[in-house]
Amino acid sequence: HTAAQDNCTCPTNKMTVCSPDGPGGRCQCRALGSGVAVDCSTLTSECLLLKARMSAPKNARTLVRPNEHALVDNDGLYDPDCDPEGRFKARQCNQTSVCWCVNSVGVRRTDKGDLSLRCDELVRTHHILIDLRHRPTAGAFNHSDLDAELRRLFRERYRLHPKFVAAVHYEQPTIQIELRQNTSQKAAGDVDIGDAAYYFERDVKGESLFQGRGGLDLRVRGEPLQVERTLIYYLDEIPPKFSMKRLT
């Protein structure tokens, strides 16, 4: 839970307050909104970032439905409850005692209920499909060059191991990045695919969460790759539970 001692900032999360009050006078950074100490050598969890971002505009995330089990986030931003490790609590409630269950990326996966609603476990989002449309270019990007560049980006910028980048699909102008990470595959210290996808989403919108690093400058063989829209699909290890009423 430390950052650079020299200027005491958090390289991986600008939405923090840092001071040299850690052990031995080391820099310690706490997330805005929650006050939770964060590890500045890796990505901060999406729950803590959302909590810190409550002053940001609504509808920051748009979701679509790739199949019958995919989730649509119609609820916009909310002030989440995070557990001591910074993960979303399985049950989220608003100030009017309306409650619902969420998955590991904080998207609602049940109908809304009251305080009696039970959410037994935090269901893991194990498959994320990032759907991008790039701005027109002189010609199509070479698929293998694009694949390599995106895998490099997720490795070097978000510290996500390439084994979790299942595939990169390309049909100009649409790029799809598939991230897969089952509970059994995620070892201690591994970046969560949900956190990597969230950082990437903010980066392509020009809202980088990194401190001091430049914004995202994606290039494929020197040609700029400029994203004009992003859609993210989330699939959970256990399908969501919505009533038929919601589906009509």
Epitope: T2, A3, Q5, P11, T12, S41, R155, H161, G189, V191
Partner: antibody, heavy 119, light 108 residues
Framework: QVQLQESGPGLVKPSGTLSLTCAVS?????????WSWVRQPPGKGLEWIGE???????SYNPSLKSRVTISVDKSKNQFSLKLNSVTAADTAMYYC????????????WGQGTLVTVSS | DIQMTQSPSTLSASVGDRVTITCRAS??????LAWYQQKPGKAPKLLIY???SLESGVPSRFSGSGSGTEFTLTISSLQPDDFATYYC??????????FGQGTRLEIK
């Protein structure tokens, strides 16, 4: 026990191409590790050259990038280094190593092979 | 690129001494730092990764600490087998991998 073994010519002429191969045993080259080359000029420190992942993703030291190619041969469980346009400054002990983690630290090393660039 | 600077360049010590080697990064690298031991004519050997995690099979007299820009390798009680050259290496995600210039630990 993971073992790495470098092989290749010990003498290369200036402006020529240095070619080395690293045979891996005790681990599959298709495992989720990185396969790196590191060099050490006589009496000097260590310099990372570059690395490859089994899928073909490569990462190179920017100072050498224009001259380096690292490739992988999954069928032979080995990976290779090519460094072209060599000069006397490329004379060094060349090590292959297995990189662990998302960005590599090196948990297994070959014993090294000395390459001299001289006419 | 991130520069890694080790100090001292040479260290003279006796068996049983407690010794500390310092490694400084030119910018914050979190805890993405490894330490290696190298003996003449041999390949480097991993001692510590992620600043303070001891590699399997490495004696517990070796320990690492630090984060951000300043790191230390400590040998709590020097053994005859420990006289060697020690290197630090950063593996931060936004920079090519770089090593320190080395610290030679010699018998006093």
């Amino acid at each position: 026990q993971v073992q790495l073994q470098e092989s290749g010519p010990g003498l290369v002429k200036p402006s020529g191409t240095l070619s080395l191969t690293c045979a891996v045993s005790g681990d599959s080259i298709s495992s989720h590790n990185w396969w790196s080359w590191v060099r050490q000029p006589p009496g000097k420190g260590l310099e990372w050259i570059g690395e490859i992942y089994h899928s073909g993703i490569t990462s190179y030291n920017p100072s050498l990038k224009s001259r380096v190619t690292i490739s992988v041969d999954k069928s032979k469980n080995q990976f290779s280094l090519k460094l072209n346009s060599v000069t006397a400054a490329d004379t060094a002990m060349y090590y292959c190593a297995r990189g662990s983690g998302v960005i590599s630290y090196f948990d297994y090393w070959g014993q090294g092979t000395l390459v001299t660039v001289s006419s | 690129d991130i520069q890694m600077t080790q100090s001292p360049s040479t260290l003279s010590a006796s068996v049983g001494d407690r010794v500390t080697i310092t490694c400084r990064a030119s910018q914050s690298i979190g805890n993405w730092l490894a330490w290696y031991q190298q003996k003449p004519g041999k390949a480097p050997k991993l001692l510590i990764y992620k600043a303070s995690s001891l590699e399997s099979g490495v004696p517990s007299r070796f320990s690492g600490s630090g984060s951000g820009t300043e790191f230390t390798l400590t040998i709590s009680s020097l053994q005859p087998d420990d006289f060697a050259t020690y290197y630090c290496q950063q593996y931060d995600s936004y920079s090519p991998i770089t090593f320190g210039q080395g610290t030679r630990l010699e018998i006093k």
